[in-house]
């Protein structure tokens, strides 16, 4: 009789995550009489996958039924087979006895496991950031295999080439993870940017998984205060306007000073969106002339999405003779913007004279 | 290590039926046929019957397949044979035994049971 | 069914001798190359212990003293040098379909 060969025709197998593997093996000899036994790896601590002889081995059924006659086919299929599974399998002969002795291994057929990247992830600053800054945004992907893949980054459709990406461990894994860092400029426009991470992965049949993270999130447009001064009414009274434009977010407070005393304080709720996802806001106020001997400087002091406070001053003109119907009044807009932070520009600094 | 362990000594009346048991252990019972050898008093082997446990797939042969008949319980890993319409010269000693290498032998055996049949 | 016919019937041998039983089947118990012929040695009030399988093969713990031979139709269990130990009746088997038993041989020493 010819000398036994353990043969496992298939060098390497590739099985979908929840699928099974079927791992291939055939004897040429029914002699001399003995079990199978499948193993991953190799040496002492080689890891038991299937003994024909005896055990359970819930996840593993052997290919051919071991009860037939000259059954000299022994291959077994996995079931259920995880990213764990990867490794290299051997199918390896044993001459019975007590106890049984290993005779002959097959070459080893290596498993590997196509796993899904799992839906990418982006997380955008802890803290919001103005236009003109730039932010990193994280995408991370887990559990794929094999390690190949493919990230990019879009911002409104165009991708971004300034970005930095990982993917781990360096070596061989059952499974990998990704994880990118894209750096992008913020506009005063993007409050309805998005940036959108994309991972192409072998898994995915060409159908890439995307994570998207707004840009909303992540920038904080301060506003420009403007003010406005409607004529002097019959009865003494000038209505002031602190007009708030283009801020973003909502979260706004407007405080009215005289003379530096508060007036009046407002929360801005529930406004009206602009095309560009900010918002205006314009408050007013009613001075009464004839309360005063001086001058009124009217100060509208904004504080927005917890920054410091930025102030818009504006005076009203008392005149120094008793009122009388047809006298004049003038306000004066003194152009002040008073900030903690020199990052905005106030554009209105001239002065505007109203006469009644 | 392989061991198949039978029931005790049965004395029967002739008619009756008998039914022995081969407990396995030590390998999976499943992966492996039994068959059922006797042999009566100073006689030689002859062989009755085998069954897959797996699948209870039986062969007989023809001599007893009227009479014997084979089962399994894979719970308690243990083979069956009975034999029924018992007469005198079915006294004998039954074996159970295991085919290790799916070739129709008789690697491993059990102690044997002696079934008597007598008036 | 394939008869098996075994020859002779008893044999009495010296120790350290060589002792042969002859095992004729009805026809061929050859299949795909292997010989589908089974020895067993039993010992009184034993139970029968597998000796060589298919036709030639020594199974595990058997001494090297014992060798199986043949082909087709006939076959030989041959002990090199008897031991009292030996002292057993021998039965062959075929499964070339369903297994029968040969009669079996008593072997004693001379």
């Known amino acids: 009789e010819e000398e036994l060969q353990v043969i496992q025709p298939e060098k390497s197998v590739s099985v979908a995550a929840g699928e099974s593997a079927t791992l291939n093996c055939t004897a040429t000899s029914l002699i001399p009489v003995g079990p199978i036994q499948w193993f991953r790896g190799v040496g002492p601590g080689r890891e038991l996958i299937y003994h024909q002889k005896e055990g359970h081995f819930p996840r593993v059924t052997p290919v051919s039924d071991p009860t037939k006659r000259n059954n000299m086919d022994f291959s077994i299929r996995i079931s259920n087979i995880t990213p764990a599974d990867a490794g290299t399998y051997y199918c390896v002969k044993f001459r019975k006895g007590s106890p049984d002795v290993e005779l002959k291994s097959g070459a080893g057929t290596e498993l590997s496991v196509r796993a899904k990247p799992s839906a990418p992830v982006v997380s955008g600053p802890a803290v919001r950031a103005t236009a003109e800054h730039t932010v990193s945004f994280t995408c991370e992907s887990h559990g794929f295999s094999p390690r190949d893949i493919t990230l990019k980054w879009f911002k409104n459709g165009n991708e971004l080439s300034d970005f930095q990406t990982n993917v781990d461990p360096a070596g061989k894994s059952v499974s990998y993870s990704i994880r990118s860092t894209a750096r992008v400029v913020l506009t005063r426009r993007d409050v309805h940017s998005q940036v959108i991470c994309e991972v192409a992965h072998v898994t995915l049949q060409g159908d890439p998984l995307r994570g998207t993270a707004n840009l909303s999130e992540a920038i904080r447009v301060p506003p420009f205060l403007e003010f406005t001064q409607q004529s002097m009414r019959a009865d003494n009274q000038v209505n002031v306007t602190c007009q708030v434009m283009k801020f973003y977010p909502q979260r706004l407070q407007l405080t009215w000073l005289e003379n530096g005393n508060v007036s009046r304080t407002e929360m801005a709720s529930a406004l009206p969106e602009n095309k560009d996802g900010t918002y205006n806001w314009t408050s007013w106020l009613l001075v009464n002339v004839s309360a005063h001997r001086d001058d009124v400087k009217l100060t509208c002091q904004v504080e927005h999405d917890g920054q410091p406070a930025v102030n818009k001053s504006f005076s009203v003109k008392v005149s120094a003779h008793p009122k009388e119907q047809g006298s004049n009044t003038a306000a004066e807009n003194t152009g002040t913007n008073e900030r903690g932070s020199s990052d905005y520009k106030d554009d209105d600094d001239k002065h505007h004279h109203h006469h009644h | 290590q392989v061991q198949l362990v039978q029931s005790g000594a049965e004395v029967k009346k002739p008619g009756a039926s008998v039914k022995v048991s081969c407990k396995a252990s030590g390998y999976t019972f499943t992966n492996y046929w039994i068959n059922w050898v006797r042999q009566a008093p100073g006689q030689g082997l002859e062989w009755i019957a085998m069954?897959?446990?797996?699948?209870?797939?039986?062969h007989y042969n023809q001599i007893f397949k009227d009479r014997a008949t084979l089962t399994t319980d894979t719970s308690t890993s243990t083979a069956y044979m009975e034999l029924r319409s018992l007469r005198s010269d079915d006294t004998a000693v039954y074996y159970c035994?295991?085919?290790?290498?799916?070739?129709?032998?008789?690697?491993?055996w059990g102690r044997g049971t002696l079934v008597t049949v007598s008036s | 069914d394939i008869v098996l016919t075994q020859s002779p019937d008893s044999l009495a041998v010296s120790l350290g001798e060589r002792a042969t039983i002859n095992c004729r089947a009805s026809k061929s118990v050859s299949s795909s190359g292997y010989n589908y012929i089974f020895w067993y040695q039993q010992k009184p009030g034993q139970p029968p212990k597998l000796l060589i399988y298919l036709a030639s093969n020594l199974d595990s713990g058997v001494p090297d003293r014992f060798s199986g031979s043949g082909s087709g139709t006939d076959f030989t269990l041959t002990i090199s040098s008897l031991q009292a130990e030996d002292v057993a009746v021998y039965y062959c088997q075929h499964s070339r379909d369903l297994p029968t038993f040969g009669q079996g041989t008593k072997l004693e020493i001379k």
């Open positions: 069954i897959d446990p797996s699948d209870s797939e039986t």
């Open positions: 035994a295991m085919d290790y290498g799916s070739l129709y032998a008789m690697d491993y």
